[in-house]
Interface confidence: medium
């Protein structure tokens, strides 16, 4: 039989009598920076180097008895969860082990910042093939260790860190609260949020994606065929970095953006019980539990987007919330979400020549978040259109009117503290799929973008009735780019995409009469790349 | 015992090269700032991360640190560098008291500081 | 269909030393490390050593350092086990078997029919 | 070094009877233990491994229990291929050998 964790990242077409995926990652090397561990356990022996690299603070403690099977035992055990021979994801990686952890489990942020440091040295010195840096450790919000973690990432390398135990926010860890690090949650066996005794998996929107991290068979340091079960959030994190192995084995010319998307779009979706998670984080946490792709290759001919949800604004009147996209995303659209209803909108700008998603809040607002539709979308140029506020009743409105540029997104934007109180909301002409139609006091923008072959549709859904929630999904073969709701609706939440569904949230239904303003109507553009879709069939 | 005696060392070489006050002020406007861990059980007060602007070179952040540890001498601090960071950050790792975070934010090149703080097993 | 086929059995002369083989099918055969077990008649069974066929490693029962000696040829999916300096008390049924991983934790799941050797005079 | 001790070393018994082996280690063994039977003439075959999870293929009225020092095989109605010797098996990690239990036959009364 297989163990429950390696058959929930298993596609059904792997899954036989033995968890024996083809090319177990054998051109990737993982580093690992942890405890000591035991190289020659069977399910790891001949797999591990053991770097000469150790820097790690004194143990707690004058009584402290100092017994190498304990002192092994976290960095052993997620050495054989990521690339153990019986138990392990990626069966084919070698890894290299760095201590940076002593035998307590606790290290320092300037001996991590050292260990990177050599990572990206032996690197420089004798370069390999992809790398794969596993950081199964957690500490306060720390700039300095974000930034080194964002060089090493820049310099192509993946990083793949515990989101942390604390049942907290991951943001206000490091390194899981930096951007360009893959952060991974943990769930159980019921696809539940792992409790760990008081505490449990940190959740949010630092938090990439969710992996198995409970009760998890792997290596034990007490002797060279034991095994353990351990949870957390490292085990967690092994379980993507033997993930991102594979496919980096299968694709090794794979950036970290492309296998950050592939490793959300292969991701079970909406499996994890929100309920667990704090009220205000529900939204922000990504419902998504790690799996391999149903095959290594031919994933190329999909257009892959993911949501980034921004800080929140803070509660003042002026504030501001940015969301960003990767270095090479694009920013496909825009929007916002404020829990009181309290906002002014949303618009895209240029900052340091790229663009960035800014949500603003409104007088009274206890402020807002901005959501970013971030693709990967090659030879891309995008740009944004913006039309001001309108005088005629009509409302405002904008297209893409260059040839060949074609509309992703929509957003509105507007000055004045309560828009569209009391006025009946504005349709959009039918068979304009090119416009955005916003409120006549709101500026409106509009993403437009070219790339080979690409080809968008807009998607409705109104409801009539009050309603707390109205989606709208794309079909099939097209991705969500663009999510936002139908101007004219005063009491509308916000708009955000989850995955590939459109998502626009009104007040509590109760606190609103069933007139015409309770109609809601949710707009998703729906993209795809017929560019992509033809590279990748001239490929087979 | 030889460890010490090397730093020993640089420290009297820094001493006599370095003139007291700042040779290269910070450019206008733009201050350091100076970081440490919300959680104050997992703070390492005492040790240092000196990040510096990051365009600056190897022998800049070297001489950053000797000239950090001459204006702490004359003060009659003693500090060590334990590290230079060269390949992804340009800074430094140094042990010194508190008292000097003032001085070291003035110095040329720096752009923030960060108190050590702990990192723990998931 | 897992299968393990000892041979190399026989009377061999005291002091005398022989080689005996195991050839396994139905498996990756260096996925799995395999043993060595003796069982002397009417005795219990006794472990010789092991091998790891995936990088030749080996490890031995102290009591037979020196006197076994465990290889493999991964190209025929074969083990092997050289015993020297062969005495009386060496007389024994000698069985391979293949150490399976069952979610946690090791056993021997399939053995070989096993091969008599007979060290007398 | 680690001692497996099994007990009996014999014992007669009825088709339908309930039968108890143990096993006791030395020192503790967690729950690394295996059972294995053998008739005369043929190989050992796998029963229990991990001191409690029964290997496929064999019958239910087979159940080990049992951690750290202290094990037991039992066959809950004894049938007639079930008459054979049992060795419990676990593996000495300070010295890094296997060690096998003397064994107990299990004889028709």
């Known amino acids: 039989s297989i163990p429950w964790n390696l058959e929930r990242i298993t596609p059904p077409r792997y899954r036989a009598d033995e968890y024996q995926p083809p090319d177990g990652g054998s051109l990737v090397e993982v580093y690992l920076l942890d405890t000591s561990i035991q190289s020659d356990h069977r399910e790891i022996e001949g797999r591990v180097m053991v770097t000469d690299f150790e820097n790690v603070p004194e143990e707690d403690g004058t009584r402290f008895h100092r017994q190498a099977s304990k002192c092994d035992s976290h960095g052993t055990h997620l050495a054989g969860v990521v690339s153990g021979r019986d138990a392990g994801v990626a069966k084919g990686a070698s890894m290299r082990s760095l201590r940076v952890l002593n035998c307590q489990g606790k290290g320092t942020v300037s001996g991590t910042l050292i260990g990177l440091e050599f990572i990206r040295k032996s690197q420089l010195v004798q370069p390999v093939g992809p790398l794969v840096v596993l950081l199964p450790l957690a500490g306060g919000y720390s700039r300095v260790l974000n930034a080194a973690c964002q060089r090493l990432a820049r310099a192509g390398v993946v990083l793949v860190t515990a989101a942390g135990n604390f049942r907290d926010d991951a943001c206000l860890y490091s390194p899981a609260s930096a951007p360009e690090v893959i952060t991974v949650g943990a769930t159980n066996a019921q696809d539940q949020p792992v409790t760990l005794g008081t505490l449990g998996t940190n959740f949010g929107r630092c938090v990439d994606l969710f992996a198995p991290g409970e009760d998890i068979i792997g290596a034990s340091s007490d002797c060279s065929t034991c095994f353990v079960s351990q949870s957390g959030t490292s085990q967690a994190a092994a379980h993507v970095a033997g993930i991102a192995a594979m496919m980096l084995s299968a694709e090794p010319e794979l950036t970290l953006a492309e296998l950050r998307q592939r490793l959300i779009h292969f991701s079970a979706k909406d499996v994890i019980n929100e309920a667990w998670f704090p009220e205000d984080q529900r939204v922000l946490t990504p419902n998504l539990v790690a799996a391999l792709p149903p095959s290594t290759h031919g994933a190329g001919w999909q257009l892959f987007c993911r949501t980034v949800w921004s800080a929140h604004s803070g509660p003042t009147r002026m504030a501001t919330a940015v969301a960003r996209c990767a270095p090479d995303e694009e920013l496909l659209s825009c929007s916002s979400f404020s829990r009181s209803g309290k906002r002014r909108g949303e618009r895209m700008e240029a900052q340091g020549g790229k663009l960035v998603c800014r949500a603003h809040n409104a007088f009274g607002g206890e402020g807002v978040y901005a959501i970013a539709r971030c693709c990967l979308l090659p030879q891309a140029n995008c740009s944004v259109h913006t039309a001001p506020p309108a005088e005629a009743s009509m409302g405002t409105r904008v297209h893409c009117h260059q040839q060949g540029h074609v509309l992703t997104g929509c957003s509105s934007h507007w000055e004045v503290e309560d828009l569209g109180t009391h006025k009946p909301p504005v349709l959009r002409p039918r068979g304009q799929p090119n416009q955005c139609v916003g409120h006549r006091e709101a500026s409106i923008h509009a993403s437009c973008c070219h790339a080979p072959g690409l080809e968008c549709k807009v998607k409705e859904h109104g409801i009539p009735a009050p309603q707390e929630q109205v989606t709208v999904a794309c079909e099939e073969g097209w991705t969500l780019t663009g999510c936002s709701a139908l101007p004219g609706t005063s009491h509308v939440l916000g708009a955000y995409a989850v995955d590939n569904t459109c998502v626009v949230r009104s007040r509590d239904v109760s606190t609103t009469g069933s007139t015409s303003e309770g109609a809601v109507t949710a707009v998703a553009i729906c993209c795809r790349s017929r560019h992509l879709a033809q590279a990748s069939q001239e490929l087979q | 015992q030889e460890d010490e005696d090397g730093d020993y060392e640089e420290l009297v070489l820094a001493l006599r090269s370095e003139e007291d006050g700042l040779a290269e002020a910070p450019e206008h406007g733009t201050t350091a700032t100076f970081h440490r861990c919300a959680k104050d059980p997992w703070r390492l007060p005492g040790t240092y991360v000196v990040v510096l602007k990051e365009e600056t070179h190897l022998s800049q952040s070297e001489r950053t640190a000797r000239r950090l540890q001459a204006q702490a001498a004359r003060r009659g601090y003693l500090t060590k560098i334990l590290h230079v960071f060269h390949g992804l950050l340009p800074g430094f790792l140094v042990k010194m008291s508190g008292d000097l975070l003032e001085l070291a934010l003035k110095l040329p090149h720096v752009d923030y500081i960060e108190e050590d703080s702990s990192v723990f097993a998931q | 269909e897992v299968q393990l086929l000892e041979s190399g059995g026989g009377l061999v002369q005291p002091g005398g030393s022989l080689r005996l083989s195991c050839k396994a099918s139905?498996?990756?055969?260096?996925?799995?490390?395999m043993h060595w077990v003796r069982q002397a008649p009417g005795k219990g069974l006794e472990w010789i050593g092991r091998?790891?066929?995936?990088?030749?490693?080996?490890k031995y029962n102290e009591k037979f350092k020196g006197k076994a000696t465990i290889s493999r040829d991964n190209s025929k999916n074969t083990l092997y086990l050289q015993m020297n300096s062969l005495r009386a008390e060496d007389t024994a049924v000698y069985y391979c078997?293949?150490?399976?991983?069952?979610?946690?934790?090791?056993?021997?799941?399939?053995w070989g029919q096993g091969t008599l050797v007979t060290v007398s005079s | 070094d680690i001692q497996m001790t099994q007990s009996p070393s014999s014992l007669s018994a009825s088709v339908g009877d309930r039968v108890t082996i143990t096993c006791r280690a030395s020192?503790?063994?967690?729950?690394?233990l295996n059972w294995y039977q053998q008739k005369p003439g043929k190989a050992p075959k796998l029963l229990i491994y991990?001191?409690?999870s029964l290997q496929s293929g064999v019958p239910s009225r087979f159940s080990g229990s049992g951690s750290g020092t202290d094990f037991t095989l039992t066959i809950s109605s004894l049938q007639p291929e079930d008459f054979a010797t049992y060795y419990c098996?676990?593996?000495?990690?300070?010295?890094?050998?296997?060690?096998f239990g003397g064994g107990t036959k299990v004889e028709i009364k």
């Open positions: 139905g498996y990756t055969f260096s996925s799995y490390w």
């Open positions: 991990a001191a409690s």
């Open positions: 020192q503790a063994i967690s729950k690394y």
């Open positions: 078997a293949r150490y399976g991983y069952y979610l946690g934790s090791y056993a021997m799941d399939y």
């Open positions: 091998i790891d066929p995936y990088n030749g490693g080996t």
């Open positions: 098996e676990s593996y000495d990690y300070s010295l890094g050998r296997y060690v």
